[in-house]
């Protein structure tokens, strides 16, 4: 029988603490045993649970991808917090990867928001002040601007 084949309670490390569920639930940092009788602690740095639960195993800790920095490590009650490296951002609609921020705004637009780990630079039309959304323009259309210098 391989380690993988064994049920969770047979794989539990000797040092994993056990306690009794409260109204069928185990506290954050724990999961419930298959028979529902015990709460078993998550393994620090490997898995976690954030809420009272009746999960049969804790949740696997996220590993930060290349291109990401680890803001805070995984604990038994909180997942790893990863953030895009400087100059890149993660959009809500494509959370699986960090994308490069645009280096500047299209002609006729001015930068009003910087690149952050969660948003691209923000561009608005000079005259109307309306936001520009969409893909980065072709390189020859791009006008770069440094802070304090309006785009020409």
């Amino acid at each position: 029988i391989t380690q993988q084949d064994l049920a969770p309670q047979q794989r539990a490390a000797p040092q994993q603490k056990r306690s009794s569920p409260s109204e069928g639930l185990c506290p954050p940092g724990h999961h419930i045993s298959e028979d529902g009788r015990d709460c078993i602690s998550c393994k620090y740095g490997q898995d976690y649970s954030t809420h009272w639960n009746d999960l049969l195993f804790c949740l696997r800790c996220t590993r930060c991808d290349s291109g990401e920095v680890e803001l805070s490590p995984c604990t038994t009650t909180r997942n790893t917090v990863c953030q895009c490296e400087e100059g890149t951002f993660r959009e809500e609609d494509s959370p699986e990867m960090c994308r490069k921020c645009r280096t500047g705004c299209p002609r006729g637009m001015v930068k009003v928001g910087d690149c952050t780990p969660w948003s691209d630079i923000e561009c608005v039309h000079k005259e109307s002040g309306t936001k520009h959304s969409g893909e980065a323009p072709a390189v020859e259309e791009t006008v770069t601007s440094s802070p304090g210098t309006p785009a020409s």
Partner: antibody
Framework: QSVEESGGRLVTPGTPLTLTCTVS????????MSWVRQAPGKGLEWIGI?????TTYYASWAKGRFTISKTSTTVDLKVTSPTTEDTATYFC??????????????WGPGTLVTVSS | ALVMTQTPSSVSAAVGGTVTINCQAS??????LAWFQQKPGQPPKLLIY???KLASGVPSRFSGSGSGTEFTLTISDLECDDAATYYC????????????FGGGTEVVVK
């Protein structure tokens, strides 16, 4: 390693029926086992599971209608009071634990139960 | 009770093509989703467990993705042998949550 269901037959409504899943090549003390059924021409329907320690859990719709139990080499599914809607092929499946997930990786060929008056 | 909604119910594609099947859970099931292939007269065969991990012997043309409540099975470089019905299932992960199956998707290979 294998699992095989038996006990499927034609029964009249209300007549209790027990299906047996016989396993070989592995120990039931190390694996959870599920029962799943499939009505003719229909999809798969999960009935319940018995854990490696013998604790049973049932689908919401199946509670009271089925009872799962086990010995060292068999897992039984008792259909307490069959109706015509229980006509189906019944499968048992071994649940493998992958560290952060279970999955039914080893299935029997199924046994057909027909409930008719 | 947990409900798994699978779409489409049937899909047709040519040999060499790509098929995408969606599965939606009525509540958060984290990454506890499995995909099965079933051919007439046979028991289901496990393809993918824990959302995206390939079961032993399953070709890499099969891939799974998603988390929480939205999941996808993709079959690329479709072969004639892929003609079957595919089911998603919320795998056992909680003592109070049903291991419900989706309604199935019939894949027809042209």
């Amino acid at each position: 390693q294998s699992v095989e269901e038996s006990g499927g037959r034609l029964v009249t409504p209300g007549t209790p029926l027990t299906l047996t899943c016989t396993v070989s090549g592995f120990s039931l003390s190390n694996y959870a086992m599920s029962w799943v059924r499939q009505a003719p021409g229909k999809g798969l329907e999960w009935i319940g599971i018995i854990s490696s320690s013998g604790t049973t859990y049932y689908a919401s719709w199946a509670k009271g209608r089925f009872t799962i139990s086990k010995t060292s080499t068999t897992v039984d599914l008792k259909v307490t009071s069959p109706t015509t809607e229980d006509t189906a092929t019944y499968f048992c499946a071994r649940e493998t634990y992958y560290g952060y997930s279970y999955a039914a990786g080893l299935w029997g060929p199924g046994t057909l139960v027909t409930v008719s008056s | 009770a947990l409900v798994m909604t699978q779409t489409p119910s049937s899909v047709s594609a040519a040999v060499g093509g790509t098929v995408t099947i969606n599965c939606q859970a009525s509540q958060n099931i984290y990454s506890n989703l499995a995909w099965f292939q079933q051919k007439p007269g046979q028991p289901p065969k496990l393809l993918i467990y824990e959302t995206s991990k390939l079961a032993s012997g399953v070709p890499s043309r099969f891939s799974g993705s998603g988390s929480g409540t939205e999941f996808t099975l993709t079959i690329s470089d479709l072969e004639c042998d892929d003609a079957a019905t595919y089911y998603c299932q919320s795998s056992w992960h909680s003592i109070s949550t049903d291991c419900a199956f989706g309604g199935g998707t019939e894949v027809v290979v042209k």
